[in-house]
Amino acid sequence: VPLSRTVRCTCISISNQPVNPRSLEKLEIIPASQFCPRVEIIATMKKKGEKRCLNPESKAIKNLLKAVSKERSKRSP
């Protein structure tokens, strides 16, 4: 992981660019806490395991979250 260090939050920069759900290995949503006062969304890509910080306020990212949660609810009985 690049630039690992002890900080309250994880993301230095964020992206508005949508991610193809099929290329996602994992999507982490870290809620605001006493350590970091903002929501952070970290997408782990299948290719190379690259991790990206996504903008929680972006419409495209909100749509991605909806798509992923829909997919998850389909899978769960």
């Epitope: 690049p2 630039l3 900080v7 230095i12 920069s13 964020i14 992206s15 970290i42 690259e50």
Partner: antibody, heavy 123, light 107 residues
């Protein structure tokens, strides 16, 4: 296109203070981590500080910790570097640079650089 | 801090030459390495990131390779505009650190 324009440099006496600015345009400043990197005359590049996209995280080189403060105003698309207790060894061209942007933790490599502003510390 | 050692510190070459610059990290940095080009009195310009990914708009004669501790920047056919100083930089861990630079001069 991406543009970064630094200002605020000049000749200043040891022990004094200075505030550098970097006006950004051509990209989504409020999404981007930003860095300051400096270069002493005839020398190589030295990373100085980083600030995250909304100003929560700041991180500094040991050589400037406690004397330099990085900050930003996203409403003005402007990055700042407050330099206190200036020393002769702070004489350098100071560049602001954009963070690459999509990597977890920020990548720490730099996409775009400003033209730089020269700070000369001399009595 | 991770030390970055570049070699050579300077080299003379002719237009059309193949030029290779090496960079060694004092400890493993995976592929978290970038290369920059700097011309006199100008700001550095990003050439390569993640050891081998070409920055948008950079000519394909530039290429990067390596991982772990040993890295290479290659210019396949040197052009007049390539005479400059080249820096490597690691971003595996804070603080980001640069090599001392390699000045490519006209033979």
């Amino acid at each position: 296109q991406v543009q970064l324009v630094e200002s605020g440099g000049g000749v200043v006496q040891p022990g004094r203070s200075l505030r550098l600015s970097c006006a950004a345009s051509g990209f989504t400043f409020s999404n981007s981590g930003m860095h300051w990197v400096r270069q002493a005359p005839g020398k190589g590049l030295e990373w100085v500080a980083v600030i995250d996209y909304d100003g929560i995280i700041q991180y500094y080189a040991d050589s400037v910790k406690g004397r330099f403060t990085i900050s930003r105003d996203n409403s003005k698309n402007t990055l700042y570097l407050q330099i206190n207790s200036l020393r002769a060894e702070d004489t350098a061209v100071y560049y602001c640079a954009t963070e690459r942007g999509t990597h977890y933790y920020g990548s720490g490599s730099f996409d775009y650089w400003g033209q730089g502003t020269l700070v000369t510390v001399s009595s | 801090d991770i030390q970055m050692t570049q070699s050579p510190s300077s080299l003379s070459a002719s237009v059309g030459d193949r030029v290779t610059i090496t960079c060694r990290a004092s400890q493993g940095i995976s592929s978290w390495l970038a290369w920059y080009q700097q011309k006199p009195e100008k700001a550095p310009k990003s050439l390569i990131y993640a050891a081998s990914s070409l920055q948008s708009g950079v000519p394909s004669r530039f290429s990067g390779s390596g991982s772990g501790t040993d890295f290479t920047l290659t210019i396949s056919s040197l052009q007049p505009e390539d005479f400059a100083t080249y820096y490597c930089q690691q971003y595996n861990s804070y603080p980001p650190t640069f090599g001392g630079g390699t000045k490519v001069e006209i033979k």
